[in-house]
Every structure is written in C-alpha cells, then in structure tokens.
Amino acid sequence: LPKAPVITTPLETVDALVEEVATFMCAVESYPQPEISWTRNKILIKLFDTRYSIRENGQLLTILSVEDSDDGIYCCTANNGVGGAVESCGALQVKMKPKITRPPINVKIIEGLKAVLPCTTMGNPKPSVSWIKGDSPLRENSRIAVLESGSLRIHNVQKEDAGQYRCVAKNSLGTAYSKVVKLEVEVFARILRAPESHNVTFGSFVTLHCTATGIPVPTITWIENGNAVSSGSIQESVKDRVIDSRLQLFITKPGLYTCIATNKHGEKFSTAKAAATISIAEWSKPQKDNKGYCAQYRGEVCNAVLAKDALVFLNTSYADPEEAQELLVHTAWNELKVVSPVCRPAAEALLCNHIFQECSPGVVPTPIPICREYCLAVKELFCAKEWLVMEEKTHRGLYRSEMHLLSVPECSKLPSMHWDPTACARLPHLDYNKENLKTFPPMTSSKPSVDIPNLPSSSSSSFSVSPTYSMT
C-alpha cells in the first residue's frame, strides 16, 4: 500500500572539526521510495557538488572536508507524492582549533608611548588569548592589558617592558603559540649630570663633567660658544647605558660650553643639552638662576597667543632658552597646519602656554603649568580626532622630529584649577568664532584627573573656541 514518508531518524546537531568529515543521516520510511533533497541555510545542495557525498538513496549527506564556512542549518526533505513532504533539520557547528591569524611582530617603541602587539585569532569555541613575557605568564595591570581582540596594549611603556613576548591562543580543542617577538624600548637622550659653571682665575684648568643616558646609548658632543670644541681633551666611558664625558680645558677666555647628548630612533634623533659658563674672575657677570629665569616673550610664533608683555619662563637647561623654546613651538606648529579649524587655535594656545609657561612671582622664578581642565578640553574636545591621529603617528614613528613629543603636555600630570585655581594657568587667548556658541557640556566629576570639569566662569578669562562650544 502507498505510504506517506516518515522521517524515522530526525537530524541532530553535528559538531565537526575543520578538514574533517561530517555526516547527517535522514532515515525515511515510505512507499514508493521518496525523493530526498538537502538544503543548507534554505539553499538547495546540488547533487553534483563535489564537496558533498549523498548516498543511501539520499539518506546520508557527507561533507567531505569541513570548512569553517560550512556552519549552518542543514535540512532534508522527503517526498513520494503520497501525503505531504516531510522535513527534518539539524545544525552543523564547525569546531576549530585555535589559529593565530595576525601574529605579533617585533616592535621598537619610545619610552612613555603606547605599544600594541597584535594577536588576532580564529577558533571555535572562541580562543582565550594570554601572553608570555620571557618564560613567565604576563600579568595585566593598570598599564598592561590584553584587549578583546587579543592584542597586547602597554600604556606609558617603561624600560622594564623590553623583552621577548609571545601570545597563546587556547580553546577546548587545543593551543596555538605565536612566534617569539621582541619589544625594544628606546629612551630619549637625557642628561643625568649637567656640567657646572665655574668662575676661575685666568690660566686655570677646569674639567667639565657631563653624564647622559638613553637607549640606544647617546653620543656626547661639546660645543664652545656655538662651535665645536677646538681645544681641550675629552675622555669618555660607557657603563650600564650611561655615557660619561669629561672635557678638560685650559682657561684663557670666558665661554659658554654646551654638552649635547644625541641618540637615534629610526630616522629621527633626540637630543638633550646642558650648558655651563666659564667666567674669569675679573670678567664675572651675574649668573642666571640655574633652573631658569623670567623674561618678556620676544618671539614671533606665539605672539598672537600669549598675553601682551607676558613674562614667560625660560628654561636654562637649554643653552639659548629663547631660541630653543621658540624652535620647539615652531616645529610643533608645522605639524598643526593640517588640523581642523576648530582644533588649531586650541592646540596653538596649548602648545605656546606649555612651552612658554607663565611665570610665578617669588624668590626663585618658577613656571606655572597649564590647568589640567584646559589641557583635557583641547585633547578630548577640540582636538579629539587629531590627538588620536598624532598618537597613532607617534607610535608608527612618522614624525620628522622628536620635538613635538615635548610640546604636548601629559594632561594627567597637570594640576587642576578645581582644587587650586592659583596652581595653574588658564588659556585665555583661545578666542575663535564667537557666533553661535553653546555651553561646554557639564562633565563635573569627583575625580577631575579623568573627567573634564566645568571650566569656571570669570570675567577675566574667556575660552571660546569652537562654533559648538565655549568656555568662560
């Protein structure tokens, strides 16, 4: 007697590893014999598709070599013209051992920047990613984090972060290890011991001593009154990444002697300078304070930004503070030519006020740092996009000069005017497009180190920068 088809073995979920065989069974009882068709995600599987084998009158579907794209719902449909067609469905879950699709690569990074070591993985179940530094599992902390993607992010890279790293991807089916990569931390040249100034008698011998460090170890050159040292003997020694240079001089005239420490980071150089004056007793002139002194700004770049006749702090760790600081701003401003019109005035004000800091009264001249709120406003509001780009370029080493790194303050290390309004300097000359102004959105927080608090209103300072935001 004719009998409508009945599926006696419904399809079940099948787990299969990549490159293995997976079989679905769809046992059917009927008379006459049914026609059985198969679909994957509602798309008909063609009988002649060589990736599949259909046997036992269509009751067995075999995927000959499973790929991760074979995931889906498979259905068999049986029909013999008696009664209606019947269908049964089951899922194929493709399981996959972990595989590292984007392994980490060797990285050279400058101390204080952010390093990201990639480690993108595939696998089912999704692999968990951990990292090994040297021979030990790497512990995450406030600076070091494994991102959702598996990449390792190290904020504010320190010398001790240098070493060999590898990532480990693990799931229930196995473990994959990346190759070992090297993180090299480079450090800007820094002078540890500056040469000291001397007031000596004519014909004395003086030894100027300059010690510097950096990674790679810097070289030290000596400059006398702006030219390479022509007389005197130089002795150098290097120990534990510290270079020690001694310049012995026979004094017959006064002079300004500058120790310049230089090291190379890719195509760029970093330099640190320290100067000492040699004066002959009867020629002696008053010495400037060894940290710096206050003077009216006489440069050009920051003329429109700094208050007229403002006294600014000039740092005597530079041989010629006015020239060096002006060059620092000039270099940074060149990078600003491409930023948006909303960002540019804010960034210019930040750079000028950071490099030529306001002077504070007192026995010893001291600079007043920029208020954290203004720094954060520039970083997170006016120049959010540009700041990210700049950080990205910095990590990839695309800047022509290391100087711009010195010209961007680290906002979190600046005092907040919320706690002491006299501890820091405002940016009063951010004055751009006064039409159509709205209020700075309030983001006051009990932790101003993170959020940008309201900038207070005051008749004496205006901070109206963008067409969208203003701060007073």
């Epitope: 206050c294 504070s360 009264p361 026995v363 005092p415 907040s416 002491d420 006299t422 180190s449 008749s459």
Partner: antibody, heavy 115, light 111 residues
C-alpha cells in the same frame, strides 16, 4: 572632595618638640603646593611655611630654624616638625592647600606650649 | 616682608547694606598682569574660607554679592548686600612673595 585632616597637636613644655601631620585626600597631592598657617587664641592668621611640588620649602622669619615642613607624596601627607617650642607658639595649626592663595583649609590641630 | 594694613578693624552693618573693607600693601603685589592678593572669611568657630583670589576673581561657590577690586597696592572687598550669615572676620593676604602675609583682619557684625 578635598579633605585635609591635621593631627599630632597637644600639650608640650617650652623647649619641647611636636610633629604635626596632615593627611590629604580627594586630589593628586603631589601636584600642589602645601602650607601651614596658625592662629593664636583670639588673634589673626599667621602664615608659617610653604612647600612646593619639588619639596623646596620657605618659612616665616618667626619659625625659621625651629620648624621644618616636609611632604610624603606616596602617603599623601604633609608634616610640620616643631622644635624648641615657645609659649607664643600656642595656636591652632592649619594645613592649607594653595600656591599663592590659600584655597582649601583643614579643621586645624591645637598646639599648647605651657609649663 | 610685605605688610598689609586692613581697615576698618571692625564694622557693624544692617542686612541689605553695602559693606567695604580696605587692604593696603606696603609694596606692589602686581606681577605678570596679576595682583597676588586674596580675601578670606572666617566665621566664628570655623576654618577660614577663600573668597577672592588675584584681587578680583571670585572662588567657585562664593555668592556674587562678594566682589574684589583694586590694583598694585590698594585693594577693596565689597559685600553688595550684607546678610546675617556674613558675620565673620575678613582677612586679606598677599601671595606675591614669601613670607606670605595677612592683614590684621576686619570684624563684621550685624546691627
């Protein structure tokens, strides 16, 4: 919220010593100048000392050589060491945050110098 | 050291009345376009509280009836409409040079 909590005051004999402490919270202590100011009973305010962010200290002439200000940025604590105390040092001693204006004040700790 | 002379030493006022307190410095406290002079209020039994810094900038949270003015050596604190809660001693202070110094104080009482 900034909090400055002074402690260490008490009764001491002339010529004696005391050490005052001020525990700061609610702000990044290391980034700010800190001061000590005192107020004798029924009298006005007298500034004593300031310490900057590099731990360079300045003093009023009346306490120079006898009092020492210091700070521990790890413990968020300001100190004032009082030596060779005199009866005229009797006062309420305040710990104050501020660079050129005295912005946030503690509640004070009482120092009494008497035989 | 810089000496600050405050006047008057005491003043009695009615609610709603305008009150002015003066502070004279023995030398200029003007530096880099700022006057380094501050005003404080000390209510009975309380710690002092900063009202005005840089001679004329009101500290956040201070009612706008308080204002500061003056430059170089002569400064004034004005309460435009005296309120009972303004009963206190008011001090001026210079932050121009160490040692920082205070005025002797002005006691403000209600009629």
């Amino acid at each position: 919220e900034v909090q400055l909590v002074e402690s260490g005051g008490g009764l001491v004999q002339p010529g004696g010593s005391l050490s005052l402490s001020c525990v700061a919270s609610g702000f990044t202590f290391s980034l700010y100048y800190m001061n000590w100011v005192r107020q004798a009973p029924g009298k006005g305010l007298e500034w004593l000392s300031v310490i900057d962010t590099h731990s360079i200290a300045y003093y009023a002439d009346s306490v120079k050589g006898r009092f020492t200000i210091s700070r521990d940025n790890v413990k968020n604590t300001l100190y004032l060491q009082l030596n060779n105390l005199k009866p005229e040092d009797t006062a309420l001693y305040y710990c104050v945050l501020g660079r050129t204006a005295l912005v946030r004040w503690g509640q004070g700790t009482q120092v009494t110098v008497s035989s | 050291e810089i000496v600050l002379t405050q006047s008057p030493s005491s003043v009695t006022a009615s609610a709603g009345e305008k009150v002015t307190i003066n502070c004279k410095s023995s030398q200029s406290v003007l530096y880099n376009q700022k006057n380094y002079l501050a005003w404080y209020q000390q209510r009975p039994g309380q710690s002092p509280r900063l009202l005005i810094y840089w001679a004329s900038t009101r500290e956040s949270g201070v009612p706008d009836r308080f204002s500061g003015s003056g430059s170089t050596t002569d400064f004034t604190l004005t309460i435009s409409s005296f309120q009972p809660e303004d009963v206190a001693v008011y001090y001026c202070q210079q932050g121009y040079s160490v040692p920082y110094t205070f005025g002797s104080g002005t006691r403000l009482e209600i009629k």
